[in-house]
C-alpha cells in the first residue's frame, strides 16, 4: 500500500498508525481500532473510519461530537463491524446481543430484533443529497461557476470520479449536490459516494481526516463559500422495511 | 402565480387500477421535484412519494411502494400517479404538491393543488 | 401511527398565544433534518407556514414563528384570530425510512 515514503504517514487518514515494515521495507498504515491494512493512495472506507473514530480515547472523541446542525448517525455513533474489504457489514450488532441491518453508509434501516436477525444482503445507498446553506454573501454566487468548483472538488480532493457526481443544484443560500453510484455502476477501484460524502461532511465541519492538509477552503472565483450548516440525505436502492410497531409515536 | 389541478378521481372497486394526474402552471415546471400527499376522510396528511425533476429518480412511502407509480412529463408539464392494487385504505384526498425549492429533489413542500377525491369501495 | 407526534388539540381565545409541539426521534428531527409546518383550514389544502424550523414564507404572518431543540420543534401561534382555526402538521424527513414524514396533526380551536 502507497504511504509517503519520507516520513510514512498516511496522507488520505490521519486516524492511522504508520510503520516502514512493508514488502521491502515499504511503510505500511494500519487503520486505528480495526488494526486493518488501508490504502492511502485513496479514501478509507466509512466503516473503519468509524471504528477508528470510536476506538480513540473518550476525551478526544468530545472534540469532534458533531454540531447541532450537524447530521448525526441515528442510534448515536457506534462502533461498527467491518467487512475483510472494510465495508459496513450488513448486520451489526451491540454488546448486549441487539442486532439491526444497515445499508452501505452504516444508517439502520431495520427494526432492532436479536442475535437471530438476518440481513441477506448490505443494500446499497445509491443516491446521496448533500443540502448546505452558505452564509450571506454580498450576492449569489454564479451557477456555473459554483458547479465547477465543486465537481472539482470531489474530483480532486476525494478522488470521486466525475460521473457520480449527478448534479448540483443552487437556489440561494441552498446548494444540492447529488451523488448517485449504482452498484453495476461502481468498478473496482472507484471511490464509493457513501465515503465521498462522509469525507466532505468531516471537512464542512472542520474535522479533516486528511494527513497534515489544511482545512477545506472552499472558494468560488475567489470568493469564500463558508458552509453554514449541512443536511445528507441517504437514498437506498431497496426501500427501508419497518414494522407499523415502530412507527408507533 | 402558482397553480396545480389534479384530476381523474372517482371511485374505484378494490384491486383496480386507476390513473390520477395534475396539471402545473405558474412555474418553471422542469426544474421542481414533486411530490404526491393523501389524506383519508377525517384523517392527517401521508406522503405518497417524490419524482426528481428530471424523473430520474422516484422514492414512496411504505404502504403504497410496489404498488404506486409516479411519472412526469416535463413537457407537458403533467405529473401523474398510477395506483394499482387499490385497497378501501387507499381511499383518500390525493394532493400534488411542489418541492419548496428548485432542487433536483427536495423534502419539504412548497405549493399544493386542491386535492383529487380517489374512492376504492365495492 | 405518525412517526412525528403531535397534540391531537390544542385551544386559547382570541389574543392570546399558543404552541404546538411536534416530538420526533434520532433519525429524523434529531439527526439535524429540518422542520417544517403547514396549516389547513377546514375544506382546504394544506399551505406551507414554516419552512426549515424558523422561516416565514412570504404573506406567512409574524404571529406565526417556529422553532426546534434536540429532537422536538414547536410552532407558536400569538395573538389568536378566529381565522387561525384549522389543523397544523408538522414535516420532517426520516432517514431510516428514506421518506417524509408528518406528525399526526393538531387541531386548533379559537374559544
Known amino acids: 500500500h502507497t504511504a509517503a515514503q519520507d516520513n510514512c504517514t498516511c496522507p488520505t487518514n490521519k486516524m492511522t498508525v504508520c510503520s516502514p515494515d512493508g514488502p521491502g521495507g515499504r511503510c505500511q498504515c494500519r487503520a486505528l481500532g480495526s488494526g486493518m491494512a488501508v490504502d492511502c493512495s485513496t479514501l478509507t472506507s466509512k466503516c473503519l473510519l468509524l471504528k477508528a473514530r470510536m476506538s480513540a480515547p473518550k476525551n478526544a472523541r468530545t472534540l469532534v461530537r458533531p454540531s447541532e446542525h450537524a447530521l448525526v448517525d441515528n442510534d448515536g455513533l457506534y462502533d461498527p463491524d467491518c467487512d475483510p474489504e472494510g465495508r459496513f457489514k450488513a448486520r451489526q450488532c451491540n454488546q448486549t446481543s441487539v442486532c439491526w441491518c444497515v445499508n452501505s453508509v452504516g444508517v439502520r434501516r431495520t427494526d432492532k430484533g436479536d442475535l437471530s436477525l438476518r440481513c441477506d444482503e448490505l443494500v446499497r445507498t445509491h443516491h446521496i443529497l448533500i443540502d448546505l446553506r452558505h452564509r450571506p454573501t454580498a450576492g449569489a454566487f454564479n451557477h456555473s461557476d459554483l458547479d465547477a468548483e465543486l465537481r472539482r472538488l470531489f474530483r480532486e480532493r476525494y478522488r470521486l470520479h466525475p460521473k457520480f457526481v449527478a448534479a448540483v443544484h443552487y437556489e440561494q443560500p441552498t446548494i444540492q449536490i447529488e451523488l448517485r453510484q449504482n452498484t453495476s455502476q461502481k468498478a473496482a477501484g472507484d471511490v464509493d459516494i457513501g465515503d465521498a460524502a462522509y469525507y466532505f461532511e468531516r471537512d464542512i465541519k472542520g474535522e479533516s481526516l486528511f494527513q497534515g492538509r489544511g482545512g477545506l477552503d472552499l472558494r468560488v472565483r475567489g470568493e469564500p463559500l463558508q458552509v453554514e450548516r449541512t443536511l445528507i440525505y441517504y437514498l437506498d436502492e431497496i426501500p427501508p422495511k419497518f414494522s407499523m410497531k415502530r412507527l408507533t409515536a | 402565480e402558482v397553480q396545480l389541478l389534479e384530476s381523474g378521481g372517482g371511485v374505484v372497486q378494490p384491486g383496480m387500477s386507476l390513473r390520477v394526474s395534475c396539471a402545473a402552471s405558474?412555474?418553471?415546471?422542469?426544474?421542481?421535484?414533486m411530490h404526491w400527499v393523501r389524506q383519508a376522510p377525517g384523517k392527517g396528511l401521508e406522503w405518497v412519494g417524490i419524482?426528481?425533476?428530471?424523473?430520474?429518480?422516484?422514492y414512496y412511502g411504505d404502504s403504497v411502494q410496489g404498488r404506486f407509480t409516479i411519472s412526469r412529463d416535463n413537457s407537458e408539464n403533467t405529473l401523474h400517479l398510477q395506483m394499482n392494487s387499490l385497497r378501501a385504505e387507499d381511499t383518500a384526498v390525493y394532493y400534488c404538491?411542489?418541492?419548496?425549492?428548485?432542487?433536483?429533489?427536495?423534502?419539504?413542500?412548497?405549493?399544493w393543488g386542491q386535492g383529487t377525491l380517489v374512492t376504492v369501495s365495492s | 401511527q405518525s412517526v412525528l407526534t403531535q397534540p391531537p388539540s390544542v385551544s386559547g381565545a382570541p389574543g392570546q398565544r399558543v404552541t404546538i409541539s411536534c416530538t420526533g426521534s434520532?433519525?429524523?428531527?434529531?439527526?439535524?433534518?429540518?422542520v417544517h409546518w403547514y396549516q389547513q383550514l377546514p375544506g382546504t389544502a394544506p399551505k406551507l407556514l414554516i419552512y426549515?424550523?424558523?422561516n416565514r414564507p412570504s404573506g406567512v404572518p409574524d404571529r406565526f414563528s417556529g422553532s426546534k431543540s434536540g429532537t422536538s420543534a414547536s410552532l407558536a401561534i400569538t395573538g389568536l384570530q378566529a381565522d387561525d382555526e384549522g389543523d397544523y402538521y408538522c414535516?420532517?424527513?426520516?432517514?431510516?425510512?428514506?421518506?417524509?414524514?408528518f406528525g399526526g396533526g393538531t387541531k386548533l380551536t379559537v374559544l
Open positions: 426549515d424550523n424558523t
Open positions: 414535516q420532517s424527513y426520516d432517514s431510516r425510512l428514506n421518506a417524509l414524514v
Open positions: 434520532s433519525s429524523n428531527i434529531g439527526a439535524g433534518y429540518d
Open positions: 419524482i426528481w425533476s428530471d424523473g430520474t429518480y422516484t
Open positions: 405558474g412555474f418553471t415546471f422542469s426544474n421542481y421535484g
Open positions: 404538491a411542489k418541492s419548496l425549492t428548485p432542487l433536483g429533489g427536495s423534502f419539504r413542500i412548497g405549493d
